[in-house]
Amino acid sequence: HNTTVFQGVAGQSLQVSCPYDSMKHWGRRKAWCRQLGEKGPCQRVVSTHNLWLLSFLRRWNGSTAITDDTLGGTLTITLRNLQPHDAGLYQCQSLHGSEADTLRKVLVEVLADPLDHRDAGDLWFPGESESFEDAHVEHSISRSLLEGEIPFPPTS
């Protein structure tokens, strides 16, 4: 799996989308987990409704919500009031029994709020994990990078 980068601004909400084959994963609940440590386990953050037919209902765990469009094949995770310590590597998972298939590896990057002058540029980012040669950045609009294309001009 390549890793997809989602960038959000501290204090705001970030939506992460994980597309999947709706037929292949028919009847399966989904989950959102966080990678602990460089080689550690993926710790469950939130999962969809216990009844698969009700997967469209948004479920919250703290500031993280999950909802599943089982017909369209898109799992959506919302991180509300994004914080610096939300940065890191996550996975969207499809559950079957005690097993979990990885739908997408996600790197969440948290950027300082450019309008918040009190904390401007005063944000810790702990880094990224895992190799992703063909990753792409997703803000509110997603697109894949073309080969050899520079993703974004450096910003400060």
Partner: antibody
Framework: QVQLVQSGAEVKKPGASVKVSCKAS????????ISWVRQAPGQGLEWMGW????????NYAQKLQGRVTMTTDTSTSTAYMELRSLRSDDTAVYYC?????????????WGQGTLVTVSS | DIQMTQSPSSVSASVGDRVTITCRAS??????LAWYQQKPGKAPKLLIY???SLQSGVPSRFSGSGSGTDFTLTISSLQPEDFATYYC?????????FGGGTKVEIK
């Protein structure tokens, strides 16, 4: 194995600029952010900022805002930290550090450090 | 900024001793705390992350505990190579901040 090799020691005059390099090897450079941390002689550690090696986004410590610029060259897997308008209290060992992969963690791998001395 | 206060600032101990270093945050940081070891002229080395998780390759004599504002690093049986300065670091909010350090010296 992962290695971060920094440029050599520098002696600068007050008001000058310094640019420290950090060449990474042993891993996919664009998969891990780089943070810069400094340590004045006999003092503790101070975080300076972070740069995304993937797209160049940066977050800087407020104290250094306007004086520091962090950049990367993905073709050579090298990160750079430039500090301008140097003062005597910028005399320190400057470290680059590889991001760890999750907010639960901190910095796994560090460069050997670059001593920057600011003196007239 | 969150202030991190380490104590003691230095401790004299002998090989085989149990050494405890504490770190207090000026506000709650959940378990977002790391511990580093630094030897003279060397870069810091990560020992513990997430307050209690042992970094790969670090000897099991090192352990971390705590949550909220109070944290502890314990070296169960001090070894010659453990004489160094230890720093705590909060990874909860911006910017990340370090404790002032605790120097573990030979008695």
């Amino acid at each position: 194995q992962v290695q971060l090799v920094q440029s050599g020691a520098e002696v600068k005059k007050p008001g000058a600029s310094v640019k420290v390099s950090c060449k990474a090897s042993g891993y996919t450079f664009t998969s891990y952010g780089i943070s810069w941390v400094r340590q004045a002689p006999g003092q503790g550690l101070e975080w300076m900022g972070w740069i995304s090696t993937y797209n160049g986004n940066t977050n800087y410590a407020q104290k250094l805002q306007g004086r520091v610029t962090m950049t990367t060259d993905t073709s050579t897997s090298t990160a750079y930290m430039e500090l301008r308008s140097l003062r005597s209290d910028d005399t320190a060992v400057y470290y680059c550090a590889r991001g760890s992969g999750s907010g639960y963690d901190s910095w796994y791998d560090w460069g050997q450090g670059t001593l920057v001395t600011v003196s007239s | 900024d969150i202030q991190m206060t380490q104590s003691p600032s230095s401790v004299s101990a002998s090989v085989g001793d149990r050494v405890t270093i504490t770190c207090r945050a000026s506000q709650g940081i959940d378990s977002w705390l790391a511990w580093y070891q630094q030897k003279p002229g060397k870069a810091p080395k990560l020992l513990i992350y997430a307050a209690s998780s042992l970094q790969s390759g670090v000897p099991s004599r090192f352990s971390g505990s705590g949550s909220g504002t109070d944290f502890t690093l314990t070296i169960s049986s001090l070894q010659p190579e453990d004489f160094a300065t230890y720093y705590c670091q909060q990874a909860y909010s911006l910017p990340p901040t370090f404790g002032g350090g605790t120097k573990v010296e030979i008695k």
